[in-house]
């Protein structure tokens, strides 16, 4: 998680301090919306189970030049502990299911205060 | 407006059985974490249940657990506390209340109780 | 599960007095995200809980600035700087960091 703390991260961000930062990112992205996030782009419904943050990860990387939820990736890749590459899907995508990468975004931050909240931060 | 607002008290015997409702307008139950918190005549508040409305990831305080379930509608946007074996201890007033939802921090709103009495 | 416990559990007091309620919990209550989850309640007969402080030491809003807390670890006080008629009530200390999530005894502010 050396990497969630930014690239000028001085050693290891604790978990908690890493998903406090991811959840700050999500709440900065929501607040700072003024047109449809990544235009309107749609994105695949995940599970929001174990495993979500390569899901979440997947789910996302196929949205391309969108600088907003750039910063948003690379925190995500962080949680993931195996390499994510732009047509990946794994079991915990609703594969019937897309919506806007703005409500993706909703429900990723909902789940995530929950789980900061909960203390469940791996 | 926020509002959450219960119903369902009354008096029943002991041994007897009582579904409380917690009706929430103005938000999304689904959006933060609604808890079940009661008070005996003249005593202190005491915290019973809490639920997760989005995922039904519930705890209890473990003298509650087995005799009271809590439980959700999400499109009625409603909470339920349904008590069995009532014992004259359980006699008290029952407040819902939800967390704040930004980082569930705390109890920003209740209701105003229903009370239930447990006698014979 | 872990107690808190209130002290005193009444106290009388006069309008403009300054008045301290103290909280200590049977083991600390600094979660596992690194807050202490502890928060201040007041309650008047026949009402529901109205929250004053919370996170130790964050008022919430609308609450008057002579309300104030403090503490770490396991001891907790709220303090009220300048008591106020609509001041007397019965205040009680709650933990939300550990689950069953606890309640203090309460303290009974009456007029003296």
């Known amino acids: 998680l050396t990497c969630l703390g930014g690239f000028a991260s001085p050693g290891p961000v604790p978990p908690s301090t890493a998903l406090r930062e991811l959840i700050e990112e999500l709440v900065n992205i929501t607040q700072n919306q003024k047109a449809p996030l990544c235009n309107g782009s749609m994105v695949w419904s995940i599970n929001l189970t174990a495993g979500m943050y390569c899901a979440a990860l997947e789910s996302l990387i196929n949205v391309s030049g969108c600088s907003a939820i750039e910063k948003t990736q690379r925190m995500l890749s962080g949680f993931c502990p195996h390499k994510v590459s732009a047509g990946q899907f794994s079991s915990l995508h609703v594969r019937d299911t897309k919506i806007e990468v703005a409500q993706f975004v909703k429900d990723l931050l909902l789940h995530l205060k929950k789980l900061f909240r909960e203390g469940q931060f791996n | 407006e926020v509002q959450l607002v219960e119903s369902g008290g009354g008096l029943v015997q002991p041994g007897g059985s009582l579904r409380l409702s917690c009706a929430a307008s103005g938000f999304n139950i689904k959006d933060t974490y609604i808890h079940w918190v009661r008070q005996a005549p003249g005593k202190g508040l005491e915290w019973v249940a809490r639920i997760d409305p989005a995922n039904d990831n519930i705890k209890y305080d473990p003298k509650f657990q087995g005799r009271f379930t809590i439980s959700r509608d999400n499109a009625k946007n409603s909470l339920y506390l349904q008590m069995n074996s009532l014992r004259a201890e359980d006699t008290a007033v029952y407040y819902c209340a939800r967390s704040e939802e930004n980082w569930y921090d705390f109890f920003d709103y209740w209701g105003q109780g229903t009370l239930v009495t447990v006698s014979s | 599960d872990i107690q808190m416990t209130q002290s005193p559990s009444s106290l009388s007091a006069s309008v403009g007095d300054r008045v301290t309620i103290t909280c200590r919990s049977s083991?600390?209550?600094?979660?596992?995200?690194?807050?202490?989850?502890l928060e201040w309640y007041q309650q008047k007969p026949g009402k529901a809980p109205k929250l004053l402080i919370y996170k130790v030491s964050n008022r919430f809003s609308g609450v008057p600035s002579r309300f104030s807390g403090s503490g770490s670890g396991t001891d907790f006080t709220l303090t009220i700087s300048s008591l106020q008629p609509e001041d007397f009530a019965t205040y009680y200390c709650?933990?939300?960091?550990?689950?069953?999530?606890?309640f203090g005894g309460g303290t009974k502010v009456e007029i003296k």
């Open positions: 083991q600390s209550i600094v979660h596992s995200n690194g807050n202490t989850y």
């Open positions: 709650f933990q939300g960091s550990h689950i069953p999530y606890t």
